[in-house]
Amino acid sequence: FNISGCSTKKLLWTYSTRSEEEFVLFCDLPEPQKSHFCHRNRLSPKQVPEHLPFMGSNDLSDVQWYQQPSNGDPLEDIRKSYPHIIQDKCTLHFLTPGVNNSGSYICRPKMIKSPYDVACCVKMILEVKPQTNASCEYSASHKQDLLLGSTGSISCPSLSCQSDAQSPAVTWYKNGKLLSVERSNRIVVDEVYDYHQGTYVCDYTQSDTVSSWTVRAVVQVRTIVGDTKLKPDILDPVEDTLEVELGKPLTISCKARFGFERVFNPVIKWYIKDSDLEWEVSVPEAKSIKSTLKDEIIERNIILEKVTQRDLRRKFVCFVQNSIGNTTQSVQLKEKRG
C-alpha cells in the first residue's frame, strides 16, 4: 500500500547502557479513527476531527505493524521478522534496546472498510541512541518502585536531571492510556495503591531549527511492600525424621517462605551431613511455587535414586537464607517397618 499519505511522527529513544530497558510505539491513528481501535481518544466532544471518521472495528488487535527497510525494499510484517518486538493490541513493545531498532515503523488498520481508510496510517520514524550524557549520573531508573500505603513519585527518566521549572511539558501514558492531568516530569502519588503498578510512558517535544521530535521513555512501575524484617521460615519438612523404604527412590522437598525484599537473593540448598563431613548436594534448580505481594514460597527437592543403608546414617539438611539470616531443618531417614 502507498505510505505517502500516512501521517508522520518522529521519536527518539535514548537508552541507558547500564540497565535493561523497554520501549513502546503507539499506533497514533488520526484522532477519530483511533477511538475505534485503541480507546485512547484525546478529543473532547467540542473538537472537530481533522479527517473523516474511520469506519474501523472495535477489535483492539485489528492493527497491522510494518517496518520500512532503509534500502527501499517492500514493507516487512513486524511479527514475522522481529522476535524482540511484540505487538500487544495497538502497541508495539521493544524488549531490548539497541541502535538496530532505529527505523521507520508503519501501523494501519487490518481491515480497510471505506475509501477514506486507505490513508488511515501512521509512519513513526524512530531514532535510537545510547545515552552519552555523563553529567546526569543519577537519572531515574526505567524500573521504579512505589511503597504501598505511602506517598511516592514516578520520574520521567529522560528528564529526571532537570528541575521542574526548566522541564518541558510532558505527556504521560499508563498502560497505553493518556493521563491527561499529568504534565510535569514527575507524577506525584499521594497514597500508593496496587493499581498504580504498570507501564508508564513519558513523552516531551524537542526541537531544533529544522524539525521537532518526541523524546520518549518507558518506566516499569512496581508497587511493593516494605522489606521483610524476618529470616525465611521452612514450611516443609516439618518433622525431623522420615520413614522410607530401602531400595526405593525418594524425593525430599524443602519449601521455604521468604518475605518480600526489594533486592531479593533467596538461597535454598540441600546439605548432607554424616559423622565426619558436611557437603552441599547437587540438586535440581529451586522453583517458585507461590508468589504474593508480601512473600514468596520457594521449593527445592533432593532426589535419591534409591535409598541405601548409607542414607540411614546421614542427615539431610535444608538450608535457607535471605539478607536477614538463615534457617535450617534436618531430616533423618528411618527404615519403614512391616
Partner: antibody, heavy 115, light 109 residues
Amino acid sequence: SVEESGGRLVTPGTPLTLTCTVSGFSLTTYAMTWVRQAPGKGLEWIGIISNSGATAYASWAKGRFTISKTSTTVDLKITTPTTEDTATYFCARGRSGGWDALDPWGPGTLVTVSS
Amino acid sequence: AFELTQTPSSVSAAVGGTVTINCQASEDIENYLAWYQQKPGQPPKLLIYSASTLASGVSSRFKGSGSGTEYTLTISDLGCADAATYYCQSYYDGAVTFTFGGGTEVVVK
C-alpha cells in the same frame, strides 16, 4: 585440571604447605581430596575438604595435617613433618561435593623429609 | 576397623589374555567402590565407579562387578599398555570407609 605445587626437601619438624590449584570447575561444587604415596608403596588417603568447606581426615592424619581452601586453591599443611612423611602427594577432585570416587588427579608433588 | 583387602598383590598374564583382581571389604559397602589404574611416574586414573560404571573415556575391556563385600575388576584382551598397578577404593560411609586397597601389580608378558 588439577595441579599440585610446593613439594621440596625439608628437615623434620619444619612445617610445609602444599598447594593444589584447580581450573575449569568450581570448588563450591566439588570436594577435593589429598592422597599420598611413599616410594614403592600403595595409595594412602589423608583427608578431604567438601564443597561447603568442611574437612575430614584419616584417623592417623588427624592433628598432623590441615586442609583449607580459597576459591581456586586447596592447601595441605604438614604441621610437623617426619621422615615417614616422605612421599608423592596427590590432590584429586571428587565426582561430587562429598565422599566419592576421585577424578581427575593432579600429577603429584614430591616431599622429602630428611635431616 | 574397616579394611579393604585386594588380591592378588601381583598377577601375570599374556597379551590377549584376561586378568581378574579381587577386592574384599570388611563390611557391606553397597557398591560404593571405585577402581584405579596407576602407571609408574603417573597419577592414578579412574576406571570404574559405583562398582560397575565405566568412567568416561575408559575402554570397555575393563569390567567391574560384585556387590555387598566382594568386588572384582576384570581386564580382558590384555595389551602391553595395561601393565600397571590397580587399586580399589571404598567411599561408602565417612572417613572410616574412605580407603584404598593395597594394590595389584599386573604384568603383561
